[in-house]
Each structure stands twice: as structure tokens, then as C-alpha cells.
Interface confidence: low
């Protein structure tokens, strides 16, 4: 999947299986990524688990779990708030669009999470205070948390290079560069560009991600995934100057 | 698919605050965590044959279950985590009802915290 980190680095990660996105004293988020096509290096998120940890008099521990074709509007115990404590309503799930869009607000830690199902796969977005991000007991023994550290260099796909290489060419030209050898050859570059431009008129990294995804999979739902990801940034990002990211400096994994 | 034992391990680790024999934890909660852990290992068993961490976990679970007299059957709901060290002390004195503490506890020291964003989408 495409990852925008807490430090506004933008990466395309081919990480497969279960990976932690966030882990601190209040919150743990894990995603499971699966290949989008047989033989493809590109992966997308098929499962998401969010654990809101027990917090003082405010909330009991609550676990939210979403999977492909299952975007519940409740925690796994069936509740929609933080439990039986006095401050239970400082944690709330709201269903925005049934089966497609859920918002979780954890006011006691100033955090908003948006989970969507777009096509077969899930998207995740969060707004969280730095104070919460940094609330970890032992920095040195922290593992690999994608939102904080980015994904390891050997798990990154350089989709910008891919995008540059395929500009103005048809799908046959990109077959060698594509991380999905079985990607449909019926999706020319021009069509991908047109579809992405429709939803994402600004040629930023979200637009480039959209083009990459269409060329890689031939699945037009990925246009919507990029579109909604940008919409969620608009809603959640505190710095309105950083909504659109344009070029990625060659990054090393953040560790 | 690859062996997911490290995921099971980290879930158990976080769920029990890393304590092998938590004196302060209620045994039922610890047992529930162990049963969740056991369930997780069973789900990934097929892909973990021969993996050190997997077999180490399986044996460890059996050992811990017997130490804590846990029954194999019972609830597997995630146990309560340890009470978290607050980023800002939510016990500050105030005339507001307790719920208000919860809604503002994270930024007691700064009226408008610096927010940050992370997102994951597409492929």
C-alpha cells in the first residue's frame, strides 16, 4: 500500500502479512497486507486491527477489527463507545456510510481515525497529537512501526521511477517495470491518467499513486482509494500547506 | 502465507504488559490472554512448521497455562492492559464532571497540541 508517515514521507510499501502501523501507550494499530494479484510485489490492506488501550477512568480496552467486506460500526465486543467508565463517551464509533466508511473518535487522546473500504481493500487515516505518538516507554526497543519509521528500504517500491518510465507508453511497455507480471494489459497509460485526473486534478503523489495502482492492477477502485485518502488528509492534516505532496526525496527507512 | 507467530507474540506481549507471572493481574484475565494467544498460534500453525519462535510459543503457552491453572476452554477476549502512564495527568482538580477530564487529558499542558497525520491506502 501507499503510506504517508507522521513526518509526511510518502512511500509505496510491498510489506506482506501483519505489520504494526502505530504502537504507543494508548493505541495499537496493525494492518495485514496481501498481494493485489498473484505474483505481484504490490500489496493492499485486507485487515485492520485497532486496540484502544485501557485508560484511567475514561475507557476500557476496546478492539476494533475490519476485514475485506466487513467494515463494522462497532468494536469486537459489540459496543460503540468506551465501555462502562465515566468517560466512556470520549471514545465513539460513527458509521458514515454503511459498510464503506467508519470514523472513530478518541477524544481522551485527541485522536480521530478514519477507516474505509474502497473496492476490496481497506484504507486508514489518523490524526493524532504528537504527544500521543511519542508516548512510548522505551524508544530503543521499539520495533518497526510504519507510521513512525516508514517501511524498510527493501520493502519499498519506487513508484515515482515507475511512473516516469511508463509516461506516454502503453501497458505493454510497462510490463517489464510492473511489480505485477500478471497485471491486465488492457489498461493503457493514457486511460489510467485520464481516470486519475478525473478525481485528482492536481498532479501530486496521490495522483501518481492512483496511476501506479491502475497500471498495476487494472482495478478502477484504486482511483477512489487515492481520492478518499486525499480527502481524509484534507480533513485530518493540521498543516493545510502539506495536503499535496509533490516529490519524494530519496528516503532511507526512518530508524 | 508466511508464519505469523511474531504477530501472535506481540499481541500477547502487549495484552499482558510483558509480564510472565503478573502478580497484579487477575488470573482469569491472564488466562483469557493465554487462550487468545493459543488461538492465534493455532491459526498460523500450518505455515509455522519448524519455526523456532512458533514452537517456543506453543510450549510456553502450555507451561504458563499450567502455572496459572488456566482451563483450555473459556473466554478469549483480550485482557485489560495495564493502566497507561498518562501523557498528561487526567486526575487534575476541576469542578467539571469526570468525563471532561477524559476529553482533555491528553493535552493538559498545551491547549492546542501539535497534530500529526498518517495514512495508508491503495497498493
Amino acid at each position: 500500500p501507499h503510506l504517508r508517515t507522521f513526518t509526511d514521507r510518502f512511500q509505496t510499501c510491498k510489506v506482506q502479512g501483519a505489520w504494526p502501523l502505530i504502537d504507543n501507550n494508548y493505541l495499537n494499530v496493525q494492518v495485514t497486507n496481501t498481494p493485489v494479484l498473484p505474483g505481484s510485489a504490490a500489496t493492499a490492506t485486507s485487515k485492520l486491527t485497532i486496540i484502544f488501550k485501557n485508560f484511567q477512568e475514561c475507557v476500557d480496552q476496546k478492539v476494533y477489527q475490519a476485514e475485506m467486506d466487513e467494515l463494522p460500526a462497532a468494536f469486537v465486543d459489540g459496543s460503540k463507545n468506551g465501555g462502562d467508565k465515566h468517560g466512556a463517551n470520549s471514545l465513539k464509533i460513527t458509521e458514515k456510510v454503511s459498510g464503506q466508511h467508519v470514523e472513530i473518535r478518541a477524544k481522551y487522546i485527541g485522536t480521530t481515525i478514519v477507516v474505509r473500504q474502497v473496492g476490496r481493500y481497506l484504507t486508514f487515516a489518523v490524526r493524532v497529537p504528537e504527544e500521543v505518538v511519542n508516548a512510548v516507554e522505551d524508544w530503543d526497543s521499539q520495533g518497526l512501526y510504519l507510521c513512525l519509521r516508514g517501511c524498510p528500504l527493501n520493502q519499498q517500491i519506487d513508484f515515482q521511477a515507475f511512473h516516469t518510465n511508463t509516461e506516454g507508453t502503453g501497458a505493454r511497455r510497462l510490463a517489464a517495470a510492473s511489480p505485477a507480471p500478471t497485471a491486465p494489459e488492457t489498461f493503457p497509460y493514457e486511460t489510467a491518467v485520464a481516470k486519475c485526473k478525473e478525481k485528482l486534478p492536481v498532479e501530486d503523489l496521490y495522483y501518481q499513486a492512483c496511476v501506479f495502482d491502475l497500471l498495476t492492477t487494472g482495478d478502477v477502485n484504486f482511483t477512489l482509494a487515492a481520492y478518499y485518502a486525499l480527502e481524509d488528509v484534507k480533513m485530518l492534516h493540521s498543516n493545510k500547506d502539506k495536503l499535496h505532496l509533490y516529490e519524494r526525496t530519496r528516503d532511507l527507512p526512518g530508524r | 502465507s508466511p508464519c505469523k507467530i511474531l504477530k501472535c507474540n506481540s499481541e500477547f506481549w502487549s495484552a499482558t504488559s510483558g509480564s510472565h507471572a503478573p502478580a497484579s493481574d487477575d488470573t482469569p484475565e491472564f488466562c483469557a490472554a493465554l487462550r487468545s494467544y493459543a488461538l492465534c498460534t493455532r491459526r498460523t500453525a500450518r505455515t509455522c512448521r519448524g519455526d523456532l519462535a512458533y514452537h517456543s510459543a506453543v510450549h510456553g503457552i502450555e507451561d504458563l497455562m499450567s502455572q496459572h491453572n488456566c482451563s483450555k476452554d473459556g473466554p478469549t477476549s483480550q485482557p485489560r492492559l495495564h493502566t497507561l502512564p498518562p501523557a498528561g495527568d487526567s486526575q487534575e482538580r476541576s469542578d467539571s464532571p469526570e468525563i471532561c477530564h477524559c476529553e482533555k487529558s491528553f493535552h493538559k499542558h498545551s491547549a492546542t497540541p501539535n497534530y500529526t497525520h498518517c495514512g495508508l491506502f491503495g497498493d
Epitope: D138, S141 | S56
Partner: antibody, heavy 120, light 109 residues
């Protein structure tokens, strides 16, 4: 007291096999894995492999695949490591070690070591 | 050659602090929470000093501490004592790779 007691020193000729034993006491034998580690004279530690007494599953270091066999006898709480087609470079002290339980992977109890000398 | 690199030797006077580094790859150290350290006196079996990067087994003095940054794990001995003179090995487990460092001789001057 948790203990691992190993068999005595061995002198072998090149091409022969050696079988080292490691008797565990003071804990539930099937609840922990057993690792085998060797150390050539003046050299560092070299991980050889691991066995689960509970299931019999093994995981061997790639360079020893085909030459090493690890087994256990749960009735006597004993682990065995057999190394075949011995070469002079197999001369080393061989240690068994208990693997920490649960979601931890470390060797928390070690045997006293068995010196195996391979010489013609 | 070991895939985990340690300095051959470090030394310090009694009461000083010494740090031993253990550098690997992202998979062997960077992504692994299973880094442990062993102390070995001449002619003796190794002894577990730290596990899971930072944790100390009971009986190990608190002057031994561990940390990790990126692909490097470190063992620090603060308040060096004569009995700390020994070889120290780091060990990492990630996936099915099990590796020891080449060892570091700590000398108390």
C-alpha cells in the same frame, strides 16, 4: 534448580559420528526448546540448530543440514545432538541450551559443554 | 564471518562505562525484538545477560543495560567491575535466522 548436564568429552576420527547428550532437570522438559551451540578453540559461538522436545520439530543451521540430527527422549528429559562425517574443523566445545518460553527467543540455561576433538 | 559485527575488544577502568555494539541488517537486528547478550568467562559456558534487547534476567546486575538504534544493538556496562572481564556475544533471532556476533573481549584495566 534448572540444570542441563552434558555427556563427557569425546575423541573421534575424521569421517566418524559423535552423539552428545544433554539431560535436563528442574523444569518441564517439553515446555522449552533446546538449542545447540558450538565453539571452536579460541573462536566465537556458532548456532547449530534447535529442537522442540514437545513436537520433535527441528530447525538446523543451513551449513550443517544433512550432517546434524537432533533428537529428544521425553521419558528421560534428555536431548541428543549427533554430528556425522566429522572433519577436523568440527573440533569444538558443544553446548546445549534451553530456549526461553513463550514469545521470547533466548537461551537462558546452558549445559557445561562437551569437548569433541576430531583428529586422525 | 559473522553476520552480526561486534568490536574485537573494548576496555575500561573499574567504575567506568563501556558500550559494546552489535551491528547487523534490518532483518537481523533492525526489525527483531529478539536480541540477546551473553557473557562468557574463559573455560565456562555462556551466561544470559540481556534478552529482548533491554530485559535483564533475575540475578544480572542492573549495571548491565541494553538498547537498540536502527540496525545496531548495544550492551552497556556502567560501573565496570573486575568480574565483568569476559567475552560478550550478541545474538539475534528474526524469522528463521539465528545469529551470533563474533564476540567482544572486555578488559578491565
Amino acid at each position: 534448580e534448572v540444570q542441563l548436564v552434558q555427556s563427557g568429552a569425546e575423541v573421534k576420527k575424521p569421517g566418524a559420528s559423535v552423539k552428545v547428550s544433554c539431560k535436563a532437570s528442574g523444569y518441564t522438559f517439553t515446555s522449552h526448546g533446546i538449542s545447540w551451540v558450538r565453539q571452536a578453540p579460541g573462536q566465537g559461538l556458532d548456532w547449530m540448530g534447535w529442537i522442540s522436545p514437545y513436537s520433535g520439530n527441528t530447525n538446523y543451521a543451513q551449513k550443517l543440514q544433512g550432517r546434524v540430527t537432533m533428537t529428544t527422549d521425553t521419558s528421560t528429559s534428555t536431548a541428543y545432538m549427533e554430528l556425522s562425517s566429522l572433519r577436523s574443523e568440527d573440533t569444538a566445545v558443544y553446548y546445549c541450551a534451553r530456549v526461553g518460553s513463550g514469545p521470547y527467543y533466548y537461551m537462558d540455561v546452558w549445559g557445561q559443554g562437551t569437548l569433541v576433538t576430531v583428529s586422525s | 564471518q559473522s553476520a552480526l559485527t561486534q568490536p574485537r575488544s573494548v576496555s575500561g577502568s573499574p567504575g567506568q562505562s563501556v558500550t559494546i555494539s552489535c551491528t547487523g541488517t534490518s532483518s537481523s537486528v533492525g526489525d527483531s525484538i529478539y536480541v540477546s547478550w551473553y557473557q562468557q568467562h574463559p573455560g565456562k559456558a555462556p551466561k544470559l545477560m540481556l534478552y529482548d534487547v533491554t530485559k535483564r534476567p533475575s540475578g544480572v546486575p542492573d549495571r548491565f543495560s541494553g538498547s537498540k538504534s536502527g540496525n545496531t544493538a548495544s550492551l552497556t556496562i556502567s560501573g565496570l567491575q573486575a568480574e565483568d572481564e569476559a567475552d560478550y556475544y550478541c545474538h539475534s533471532y528474526a524469522g528463521t535466522d539465528t545469529l551470533f556476533g563474533g564476540g567482544t573481549k572486555v578488559t578491565v584495566l
